[in-house]
Amino acid sequence: HTAAQDNCTCPTNKMTVCSPDGPGGRCQCRALGSGMAVDCSTLTSKCLLLKARMSAPKNARTLVRPSEHALVDNDGLYDPDCDPEGRFKARQCNQTSVCWCVNSVGVRRTDKGDLSLRCDELVRTHHILIDLRHRPTAGAFNHSDLDAELRRLFRERYRLHPKFVAAVHYEQPTIQIELRQNTSQKAAGDVDIGDAAYYFERDIKGESLFQGRGGLDLRVRGEPLQVERTLIYYLDEIPPKFSMKRLTA
């Protein structure tokens, strides 16, 4: 697993412990919580990051949904089960044997049930809408400059292939970033849009996951872009299955 060999650290994930005891005596970085080795040349999966963060304070929120099938992360933090590749297992359960199904970004997509609940497959989140509101500025940002800066950010900081940034919309003070990535589009080695969105979310909150790097300093033509509110909506390839009671609540 690639890491900075000289001092054996993980540039892309500060929630690791690194030691020169990997194959061939190379540096190996293990995610806190799970102990799984991570590839430090790319982003760590959201599941392993959540597992590492499980002791952090709960931060539940309730958001307005932009479409009937969009999901938001209302449940806050939980200690997830990750598969051997570091992805979320389709079924998640807590210590009181309450279970639910999640999508590929770990957001609940069914009502909660008991241990008999079946989640046949991990449903892919193929469309993520990141809704930002920036702090007041002297004037509106130039849309094309803003678009270019955000695309550069996702390409360079999060290593997300440009084709997965579908659009950047802007109506001052609201910025919307659309990420799209179907199962068929995602090749081996491609960063997952869910992981990129999670790193971006943590950066925006001033909780960068990168090792030793300064926090996110977003500027458009030298003008600071300061975000005061972030909402993230998730759309799955198969619509979620909630009871009518929840949908009308």
Epitope: V17, S19, D21, Q28, R30, L32, P84
Partner: antibody, heavy 115, light 107 residues
């Protein structure tokens, strides 16, 4: 050469605690995990947990989580494993071992729990 | 927790014969498996690292193979000092776990 030297045998009463030490030498102490593994008489090996000496990050097997504490003293390159609320089934040889592959082992410390 | 199952529990062979010991993981673990030899009254000794990597000072007759869930330790030609208990362990994720051991005895 790399060496892990453990403290001597202990005899304890049920309900008591035991603290076993493991002194490391011959390598950069803060760079490698130290694991604790135990072996009951005639039984197999059981991983208890580990500690990363650089920052004291420790991780415990759930079976022992409420009873085990692992600490380190970087000034003496020593790791400690304390097991509390001892019962007869804790009678075992306790080993410290370096790294994720347990490439070097201490000689073992026999802990006998008997009333 | 990843469960490692070793087989056979006991293997009876004669010096000069080839020994094949198996370790199977309950889930895929890449090559994060290690093999140890333990003799009575001694601490275990690492033989093979990360499924197939040889260890300095360990005789060349010891070799390892496998990836995913199935792993093998092979001793090409048994020497009298090889009769001992052999364990596999996984370092894929916490908690690290060991197999129950294979006792290699003289036939």
């Amino acid at each position: 050469q790399v060496q892990l030297v453990q403290s001597g045998a202990e005899v304890k009463k049920p309900g008591a605690s035991v603290k076993v030490s493991c002194k490391a030498s011959g390598y950069t102490f803060t760079s490698y995990w130290i694991n604790w593994v135990r072996q009951a008489p005639g039984q197999g090996l059981e991983w208890m947990g580990n500690i990363f000496p650089s920052d004291s990050y420790s991780n415990y097997n759930k079976k022992f989580k409420d009873r085990v504490t692992m600490t380190r003293d970087t000034s003496t390159s020593t790791v400690y494993m304390e097991l509390s609320s001892l019962r007869s089934e804790d009678t075992a040889v306790y080993y410290c071992a370096r790294g994720s592959g347990f490439d070097y082992w201490g000689q073992g410390t026999l802990v006998t729990v008997s009333s | 927790e990843i469960v490692l199952t070793q087989s056979p529990a006991t293997l009876s062979l004669s010096p000069g014969e080839r020994a094949t010991l198996s370790c199977r993981a309950s889930q895929t673990i890449g090559t994060s498996i290690h093999w140890y030899q333990q003799k009575p009254g001694q601490a275990p000794r690492l033989l093979i690292y990360y499924a197939s990597e040889s260890i300095s000072g360990i005789p060349a007759r010891f070799s390892g193979s496998g990836s995913g869930t199935d792993f093998t330790l092979t001793i090409s030609s048994l020497e009298p000092e090889d009769f001992a208990v052999y364990y596999c362990s996984q370092s894929f994720s916490w908690p690290f776990t060991f197999g129950q051991g294979t006792k290699l005895e003289i036939k």
